[in-house]
């Protein structure tokens, strides 16, 4: 075996020392005679040592001994000892006691022979065995004074060879991770949890991660066990983006022909039933009413115009009932109602005129007289030397209950080419020109249009008391929605509990699956914030789709175009959710169409307003938006613009 050079020299030096042993002893006797018993000169000392280095080392110190103890002739024992020790440079021992094996006296010098693990001239320096090839250790080498030892990283143990390490399988201990899954790793182990959970080393269990604290959502965040959901301000026109964290605008995906005609007057703008136009005519010269206009509607009922004085004097109201013209009139306190002519709510333009003649009123449709009514008096009433006539369009200047026969005054209709009293009317034209809300869609079809900016609501009851007295009342919610959406997100139908500010039920369009966090176009049926069922829908194809929802004790179904949706809850969860719905239905609820009131975004899967055409049937009854308790003025009750034709 080959030894390193340093060790080799240490090994050889003692042998060398033994070769000089005899010579050294002889030299010691010679020194005794020449310089201890006698006083010696430098030359005599040179003869003893036979070399200059030792002589040069010895002689000055020899003179020091004389100075200290006197000359040899004084026979001071201290002198003899002093001189005898001078040539032995290992006395006193200059080498480090811990690290030295032996001290070798040399010519005016010494050599410290070190023990293994020590080095340096005096063997006082620890040799770092770890600095070369890690001391032969596989992992950790620990240097010690004069020695070293190997050890292993946490998770490993030292093999019997004292140098290599082997992995400890911590998972062999069933308590290593507690409730969590244990995975052994080289030198370690990991306690694993499902996504959305994090391991708690203190509790040795998986705990839900509150992702909401990490600020993942742009707007509202709701944490759930193992997951989270982000919500966007639907009422503000926002929905979740592709990343399911940020929000983006709800944009139309189907272009509707919403262009308006500046030369038209929309009669359905005021949901309150108040007139859209109020005109005051005043003349010095007695004048008769002449009114002519083109008219278009799909609405079966509502008021076209009123002409006359205050409600107790003389007036006429031209209205529509069951699609036919109706004339209500009051002359000097006596009221009458006449209805005649063809059904005119077919959605096509026709010319209607009202003419006050000497003793009768003539109503014409497309220049054909459909009513001729004898009257006693004039509509223009004299007052302080002037003749007065109030004319209102799309409503009456008093409450509809004060009519001869009550009528729903709201009329989703359109007028153009109007002419009042044979005069040019710049006032209305100018007003309409600058106010798009007073204008009609250029083209309309049957249906109701929800522009994505408002809702309507009704006060409907869903509880049914059976004929057998004493039995529990049952409940039922059956909704059929004929929809032609213009956007992929929005509430079609919902129930709202004002007292609890909760959304007991909602049916909506949504463009993602919230639990799978997957973008997909769906119809969702939900009780409060829990989705009961989902069904795919091709929402942006410009076609009409039929969404049917049926909920009653014990069952909930969702269908889109005749195909049943997939349940999102277990049978037990469904029963629990239906019980929640029933509890709500026993208290006052409002029925919402096209949107929700200002509720928290977490109240329902969707809070955005619906955009597109829709007609709703609830419990086998068609909902008429003119009959709603409230309707946003931009929702058109009986007309809907068509889908824009695709560009060639």
């Amino acid at each position: 075996a080959l030894l390193p050079a340093r060790e080799a020299t240490q090994f050889l030096r003692p042998r060398q020392r033994r070769a000089f042993q005899v010579f050294e002893e002889a030299k010691q006797g010679h020194l005794e005679r020449e310089c201890v018993e006698e006083l010696c000169s430098r030359e005599e000392a040179r003869e003893v040592f036979e070399n200059d280095p030792e002589t040069d080392y010895f002689y000055p110190r020899y003179l020091d001994c004389i100075n200290k103890y006197g000359s040899p002739y004084t026979k001071n024992s201290g002198f003899a000892t002093c001189v005898q020790n001078l040539p032995d440079q290992c006395t006193p021992n200059p080498c480090d006691r811990k690290g030295t094996q032996a001290c070798q006296d040399l010519m005016g010098n010494f050599f410290c022979l070190c023990k293994a693990g020590w080095g340096g001239r005096l063997c006082d320096k620890d040799v770092n065995e770890c600095s070369q090839e890690n001391g032969g250790c596989l992992q950790i080498c620990h240097n010690k004074p004069g020695s070293f030892h190997c050890s292993c990283h946490s998770g490993f143990e030292l093999s019997s060879d004292g140098r290599t390490c082997q992995d400890i399988d911590e998972c062999a201990d069933s308590e290593a991770c507690g409730e969590a899954r244990c995975k052994n790793l080289p030198g370690s182990y990991s306690c694993l949890c499902d996504e959305g959970f994090a391991y708690s080393s203190q509790e040795k269990a998986c705990r839900d991660v509150d992702e909401c604290l990490q600020g993942r959502c742009e707007q509202v965040c709701v944490n759930s066990p193992g997951s989270y959901t982000c919500h966007c301000d639907g009422r503000g026109g926002l929905k979740l983006s592709q990343d399911m964290d940020t929000c983006e605008d709800i944009l139309p995906c189907v272009p509707f022909s919403v262009a308006k005609s500046v030369k038209s007057l929309y009669l359905g703008r005021m949901f309150s039933g108040t007139p859209v136009i109020r005109l005051r005519f005043k003349r010095l010269q007695p004048t008769r009413l002449v009114a002519e206009f083109d008219f278009r509607t799909f609405d079966p009922e509502g008021i076209l115009l009123f002409a006359g004085g205050h409600q107790d004097s003389t007036w006429i109201v031209l209205a529509l009932r069951a699609g036919r013209l109706e004339l209500q009139l009051r002359y000097n306190g006596v009221g009458r109602v006449t209805s005649s002519g063809p059904v005119i709510n077919h959605g096509m333009w026709q010319t209607i005129s009202v003419e006050e003649l000497a003793r009768n009123l003539v109503i014409k449709v497309n220049r054909d007289a459909v009513m001729k009514i004898a009257v006693a008096g004039d509509l223009f009433q004299p007052e302080r030397g002037l003749y007065h006539l109030n004319l209102t369009v799309g409503g009456i200047p008093f409450h509809e209950k004060d009519l001869v026969q009550p009528i729903n005054p709201r009329l989703d209709g359109c007028m153009r080419s109007w002419n009042w009293l044979n005069g040019e009317d710049t006032t209305i034209q100018e007003t309409v020109k600058v106010n798009t809300r007073m204008q009609c869609f250029s083209v309309t079809e049957r249906g109701s249009f929800y522009p994505g900016s408002g809702f309507a609501f009704y006060s409907l009851d869903y509880m049914r008391t059976p004929l057998d007295v004493g039995t529990e009342s049952t409940w039922e919610v059956e909704v059929v929605a004929h929809i032609r959406p213009a956007a992929d997100t929005g509430v079609l139908f919902a129930l709202w509990a004002p007292d609890l500010r909760a959304v007991p039920l909602s049916v909506a369009l949504v463009d993602y699956h919230s639990t799978k966090k997957l973008k997909k176009q769906l119809v969702v049926l939900a009780v409060e914030h829990t989705a009961l069922a989902l069904m795919e829908i091709k929402v942006c194809d410009g076609q009409e789709h039929v969404v049917t929802v049926s909920l009653r004790d014990g069952e909930a179904t969702l269908e889109v175009d005749g195909t049943r949706g997939q349940s999102e809850v277990s049978a037990a969860q469904l029963q629990e959710r239906l019980a929640v719905l029933e509890r709500h239905l026993r208290s006052p609820v409002l029925t919402f169409a096209g949107g929700l009131p200002d509720v928290p975004v977490t109240s329902a899967p969707v809070t955005a307003f619906y955009r597109g055409c829709m007609t709703l049937e609830v419990n086998r009854r068609l909902l008429d938006l003119d009959e709603a308790a409230y309707k946003h003025s931009d929702i058109t009750a009986h007309s809907c613009p068509p889908v824009e034709p695709a560009a060639a």
């Epitope: 003349r283 010095l284 007695p286 030397g385 005069g423």
Partner: antibody, heavy 116, light 107 residues
Framework: QVHLVQSGSELKKPGASVKISCKAS????????MNWVRQAPGQGLEWMGW????????TYTEEFKGRFVFSLDTSVTTSYLQISTLKAEDTAVYFC?????????WGQGTLVTVSS | ETTLTQSPSSLSVSTGDRVTITCITS??????MNWYQQKPGKPPKLLIS???TLRPGVPSRFSSSGSGTDFTFTISSTQPEDFADYYC?????????FGQGTKVEIK
């Protein structure tokens, strides 16, 4: 569109008569009455009265009863104002204006100067 | 006969100033008040008709308020073309009567 065009300025001597015209166009003449308004130099507006274009019946305010006459010729859709026995204080601009309870359409005005 | 008292008879203002003219009637005329602007050599122009209704094409800086016997006409920020005479006219009863007029001059 509605137009009311009046006859030109008149310079008359005191005691003379003057007849000024107001020609209407752009609407059915008999559907609206015709008003007459006076404005003396540097003064305000005064309503003189009106004429029923259906019947031809005039109505005058108290101040303008007597020497002032409103008349019509429906065949040429024209209304007239005649002032007899002119006085210096009759010097004014005379306007015709269509009846709408208030006055939207006006003639351009006719200046009548009475000076010896 | 309803008499109208219009004030002030004249006022000097700078461009951009607010102008307020009042008209007080001797009887209650509801809101049957009208306001006219007249420039030299021209017929009056109707700015506001009954019911404080701004006429088509009239700038929105012109407005009026009032009902009964007290009426106010306002120019929110006078423009160079607004220097003219202004009249109120009641159309509640015959005879129709005008106010004496207000001359709005450049300061």
């Amino acid at each position: 569109q509605v137009h009311l065009v009046q006859s030109g300025s008149e310079l008359k001597k005191p005691g003379a008569s003057v007849k000024i015209s107001c020609k209407a166009s752009g609407y059915t003449f008999t559907n609206y009455g015709m008003n007459w308004v006076r404005q003396a130099p540097g003064q305000g507006l005064e309503w003189m009265g009106w004429i029923n274009t259906n019947t031809g019946e005039p109505t005058y305010t108290e101040e303008f009863k007597g020497r002032f006459v409103f008349s019509l010729d429906t065949s040429v859709t024209t209304s007239y104002l005649q002032i007899s026995t002119l006085k210096a204080e009759d010097t004014a601009v005379y306007f015709c204006a269509r009846d709408e309870g208030w006055f939207v359409y006006w003639g351009q005005g006719t200046l009548v100067t009475v000076s010896s | 006969e309803t008499t109208l008292t219009q004030s002030p008879s004249s006022l000097s203002v700078s461009t951009g100033d607010r102008v307020t003219i009042t008209c007080i009637t001797s009887t209650d005329i509801d809101d049957d008040m009208n306001w006219y602007q007249q420039k030299p050599g021209k017929p009056p122009k109707l700015l506001i008709s009954e019911g404080n209704t701004l006429r088509p094409g009239v700038p929105s800086r012109f407005s009026s308020s009032g009902s009964g016997t007290d009426f106010t006409f306002t120019i929110s920020s006078t423009q160079p073309e607004d220097f003219a005479d202004y009249y109120c006219l009641q159309t509640d009863s015959v005879p129709l009567t005008f106010g004496q007029g207000t001359k709005v001059e450049i300061k």
